[in-house]
Interface confidence: medium
């Protein structure tokens, strides 16, 4: 079979948005299925039509309805004779447009007075293609090739900047470019401390705007009163937005203020936030925990605990635990150092053990009290212990 | 003159095989693609696929991929749809078209019944 | 799956014109096809390659195509003319072929 791409030279130059229409001939056979290729993958296009003009020669149309970039290539017709392909020589489909960016210049922030660089590049065909530099509304420079670097030596408010490429097909122009002035960053807001201690303070906070320069660090400076001598300072890298501060005192007040900074320097401090720190929980236990029993049940008592230290605060109610054998158990808490017990199985062991607590929590508990079903009254000893 | 004369009319129980006809005639069968075109009752026209001129290719819509095979017999110039499982909601009119987007000549239609 | 998208139904006075849209995003690159067919007959081939007319096709029909949208326009449409609309185009790929959800045309 003869085959043959008809009224398209070895190459054909169209104009982005036209038609084209690829004519194959073929000939010395009667049914011939064409199929067409491009630049070796073929095309799975049903815009196709078969004209016979013969018995043994058909001519197959493959149509492009408006051609664009991607269409461009090498293009062939093939058919299937006798378990063999047989192929055309190849038509080179060239698609010309007004340029085509493949880098348009971009937006940045600089420091004020700062030296900059935009890119720009696009390409035809048609070649050669130009640029034209545009800052605002004035065009700056005469045309260049493309690729085009322009040179800025400094800006002193937000500006744009946009580039125009030419070819003989006509001109395009690029996205417009904004180049803004970097500051100082704002001040952070919505400091918060949570996770308090006796002795550490976790802070958060929400960065202000970064003056359109990436905020490097933060510094969280800690005093003992608003205006007081500095406690601490520590300067976090971020993100993230928190510090962890240790090594505070106990029961202490305290007030602490942040600021971030980028690389033109350090924002405001934000306002001064006060916090407190945790008291310690009771170091001691009570002593002495002995038992009575009465006629209405059995009455607990124990010594009182005096604070060991101030930072203990005052120190609050006791609070005492029991359980029985049969899996029975209760807590309760009073106020002064002795209890009525309720509830409980006089036939069975009775385990009592009592804390005294504070704002921060209960201190250790006592030596554990064993109330035996057998005892008229408990005394305090190890588990299991009997009194006779 | 270019006819496409069809199969009559069937009624088949979900789950049946079918095969429905197309025979060309007044054209050389080889000169034209043959496509297969659905019409559910009082809806709209869907492309079901076309077969080349020379019957080595088939082409198919999404929704019938795998689902119908269409096939001809040059010898004889008969198109062919088929199904190998029918569904009720295969139930519609079925046009054999010469051609694949120039749809000029269009046969009058086979209608398939598929009800338990 | 591609679609193209008609309008269900477009309602004029005799000798108005009928505009029916339809829209693909295949359309800028693919050919529309508009068929006709008139109730319990097969479908007629009215325009092809977006906007020539097939032979035997009265005058008053014609087609265009703009970016993603195909128009078939009825210039002083007739009692006749009332029937059923398919656009017919492939998908971007050109793999497969579709029709449009169809637009009755009234003609009161």
């Known amino acids: 079979a003869g085959l043959k791409l008809m009224g398209a030279p070895v190459k054909l130059t169209v104009s982005q948005g036209q038609p084209v229409k690829l004519n194959c001939s073929v000939e010395g056979m009667e049914e011939p299925d064409i199929q067409w290729v491009k630049d070796g993958a073929v095309v799975q296009n049903l815009d196709q039509l078969y004209i016979p003009v013969s018995e043994q020669h058909w001519i197959g149309f493959l149509s492009l309805k408006s051609v664009e970039r991607s269409d461009a290539g090498r293009y062939w017709c093939q058919v299937e004779d006798g378990g063999e392909t047989e192929i055309s020589q190849p038509v080179w489909l060239t698609v010309e447009g007004v340029p085509f960016f493949t880098v348009e210049p971009k937006d940045l922030a600089v420091p004020p007075n700062a030296p900059f660089q935009l890119s720009c590049e696009a390409v035809g065909p048609p070649e050669p293609v130009t640029i034209v530099w545009w800052r605002g509304t004035t065009k700056i420079g005469g045309p260049a090739p493309s690729p085009s670097v322009l040179n800025v030596t400094g800006v002193t408010q937000s500006t744009m900047f946009s580039c125009e490429a030419h070819n003989l097909k006509g001109l395009a122009s690029s996205r417009t470019a904004t180049v803004h002035l970097q500051a100082l960053p704002a001040a952070p807001f919505n400091i918060t401390v949570t996770k308090l201690s006796s002795s550490n303070a976790s802070v958060a906070w929400m960065p202000g705007a970064d003056g359109r320069a990436l905020l490097q660090s933060c510094t969280v400076q800690v005093t003992q009163a608003p205006g007081g001598w500095e406690v601490l300072a520590v300067v976090v890298p971020v993100p993230p937005f928190t510090c962890l501060l240790r090594d505070l005192v106990p029961a202490t007040n305290y007030s602490l203020r942040v600021r971030c900074a980028n690389a033109l320097g350090p924002s405001p401090y934000a306002d001064w936030v006060p916090f407190q720190t945790k008291g310690l929980a009771p170091a001691s236990a009570p002593q002495n925990l002995h038992a009575i029993r009465t006629d209405s049940g059995l009455i607990l008592e124990w010594e009182e605990v005096i604070p060991e230290a101030p930072l203990e605060g005052p120190l609050g109610p006791y609070k005492l635990s029991w359980v029985q054998d049969n899996g029975t158990q209760d807590e309760l808490t009073v106020e002064g150092t002795r209890a009525n017990l309720t509830g409980w199985d006089p036939q069975k062991d009775l385990i009592v053990r009592v804390c005294v607590s504070n704002a921060v929590g209960c201190g250790p508990w006592s030596q554990p009290l064993v109330v035996s079903s057998h005892d008229r009254a408990g005394q305090q000893g190890p588990p299991h212990s009997r009194t006779s | 003159e270019v006819q496409l004369v069809q199969s009559g009319a069937d009624v088949k129980k979900p789950g049946a095989s079918l095969t429905i006809s197309c025979q060309a005639s007044?054209?050389?069968?080889?000169?034209?693609?043959i496509s297969w075109v659905r019409q559910k009752p009082g809806k709209g026209l869907e492309w079901m696929g076309s077969i080349t001129r020379s019957s080595s290719r088939t082409h198919y819509g999404p929704s019938f991929q795998g689902h119908v095979t269409i096939s001809a017999d040059r010898s004889t110039a008969t198109a062919y749809l088929q199904w190998r499982s029918l569904e009720a909601s295969d139930t519609a009119m079925y046009y054999c078209?010469?051609?694949?987007?120039?749809?000029?000549?269009w046969g009058p239609g086979t209608l398939v019944t598929v009800s338990s | 799956s591609y679609e193209l998208t008609q309008p269900p139904s477009v309602s004029v006075s005799p000798g108005q014109t009928a505009r029916i849209t339809c829209s693909g995003d295949?359309?800028?690159?693919?050919?529309a096809y508009w068929y006709q067919q008139k109730s319990g007959q097969a479908p007629v081939l009215v325009i092809y390659?977006?906007?020539k007319r097939s032979s035997g096709i009265p005058e008053r029909f014609s087609g265009s195509s703009s970016g993603t949208m195909a128009t078939l326009t009825i210039s002083g449409a007739q009692v006749e003319d009332e029937a059923d609309y398919y656009c017919y185009s492939a998908n971007q790929r050109g793999n497969y072929m579709v029709f449009g959800g169809g637009t009755k045309l009234t003609v009161l």
């Open positions: 078209v010469r051609g694949y987007t120039h749809l000029r000549t």
């Open positions: 390659e977006d906007s």
């Open positions: 295949a359309l800028p690159k693919k050919y």
């Open positions: 007044g054209y050389t069968f080889t000169d034209y693609w």
